[in-house]
């Protein structure tokens, strides 16, 4: 069964900076990745970034840079300023659309009272949906 992992970490040098790492474990090729915060995509979450292997990437503040790390994993750098919802205690969700498996989504968040540089467990799966 395909699986999505989500890892959230606070940057040690900049307490208002976060990085979200997401990956897809399974066969098939990734056709689109959507990162959201505050909940799953299409279910109350706010879209932070979309990444497409050919069409490129888009990110929305407070996201600063979305990029592919491998063919099946991405990272998203964020800066906690300006938006109406701070995200220190927020859930981040990553949805991977792949062929032929469909869409798989998982969410994770920064662990409570985490020290800078520490990250969430590598495979939190509070939500796992196949569309």
């Amino acid at each position: 069964t395909p699986e999505v992992w989500v890892q959230v970490q606070m940057e040690a040098t900049e307490l208002s900076s976060f990085t979200v790492h997401c990956g897809f474990l399974g066969p098939g090729s990734i056709s689109l990745v959507t990162v959201s915060w505050g909940g799953p995509d299409g279910a109350g979450g706010t879209k932070l970034a979309v990444l497409h292997p050919e069409l490129g990437t888009r990110q929305w503040a407070p996201a600063r840079q979305a990029r592919w790390e491998t063919q099946s994993s991405i990272s998203l750098a964020l800066e906690d300023s300006g938006a109406s919802s701070p995200f220190a205690n927020t859930t981040f969700c990553c949805k991977f659309a792949s062929f032929p498996e469909g869409s798989w989504e998982s969410c994770g968040s920064l662990p409570p009272s985490s020290d800078p540089g520490l990250s969430a467990p590598p495979t939190p799966v509070p939500i796992l949906r196949a569309d």
């Epitope: 909940g39 109350g44 879209k47 069409l55 888009r58 929305w60």
Partner: antibody, heavy 119, light 106 residues
Framework: QVHLQQSGPDLVKPGVSVKISCKAS????????INWVKQRPGQGLEWIGW????????YYNEKFKGKATLTVDKSSSTAYMLLSSLTSEDSAVYFC????????????WGQGTTLTVSS | DIQMTQSPSSLSASLGGKVTITCKAN??????IAWYQYKPGKGPRLLIH???TLQPDIPSRFSGSGSGRDFSFSISNLEPEDIATYYC????????FGGGTKLEIK
């Protein structure tokens, strides 16, 4: 066909507030950011802020914090911008625009709402 | 804040000719720049995004290029309906418009 229909022109007195609407059709309203843009007579375009209709999350240009408040009504696929404590500096054409994501920023625009602030 | 300097602020060209408008960012914006055509009475029209990607309904006589901080936009084989004001927009982080270029036909 994507369409953004804005409310009509308004003439208001200084000091009051006004709410401009932008009704979206032809796409899933909750999936795309709605932005608001200001154009003063004889001047360029200024980004005011955005709202993500799916969650109601907002983000404002620092210059417009306290001046503009963005909201949505998901049931009617309508975005609103409330402008408060109006002065003559707020006289402008205001546009709503959808951010199309990978299809490009501000890919569809409303026709604009002309606001005149005058005593 | 990212600032966009657009030039020239106005220009005049002949029908059938070519014009080029430039936009310079005060920091690297990758390729996140879009170009719009604006005519009073209607909303602006997206022509190009991601530096050079033409919108589906836009003719190929419109083009864009550049990367980093320096970008340009060209219209070749000018037609009467091209009379408008053109704006660049950076969308690498938030959004900033250039000051606009008013195009007139000689």
């Amino acid at each position: 066909q994507v369409h953004l229909q804005q409310s009509g022109p308004d003439l208001v007195k200084p000091g009051v507030s006004v709410k401009i609407s932008c009704k979206a059709s032809g796409y899933t309203f909750t999936d795309y950011y709605i932005n608001w843009v200001k154009q003063r007579p004889g001047q360029g375009l200024e980004w005011i802020g955005w709202i993500f209709p799916g969650s109601g999350t907002t983000y404002y240009n620092e210059k417009f914090k306290g001046k503009a408040t963005l909201t949505v009504d998901k049931s009617s696929s309508t975005a609103y911008m409330l402008l408060s404590s109006l002065t003559s500096e707020d006289s402008a054409v205001y546009f709503c625009a959808r951010d199309g994501g990978l299809r490009g920023p501000f890919d569809y625009w409303g026709q604009g709402t002309t606001l005149t602030v005058s005593s | 804040d990212i600032q966009m300097t657009q030039s020239p602020s106005s220009l005049s060209a002949s029908l059938g000719g070519k014009v080029t408008i430039t936009c310079k960012a005060n920091q690297d914006i990758n390729k996140y720049i879009a170009w719009y055509q604006y005519k009073p009475g209607k909303g602006p029209r997206l022509l190009i995004h991601y530096t050079s990607t033409l919108q589906p309904d836009i003719p190929s006589r419109f083009s864009g290029s550049g990367s980093g901080r320096d970008f340009s936009f060209s219209i070749s084989n000018l037609e009467p309906e091209d009379i408008a004001t053109y704006y660049c927009l950076q969308y690498d982080y938030l959004y900033t418009f250039g000051g606009g270029t008013k195009l007139e036909i000689k």
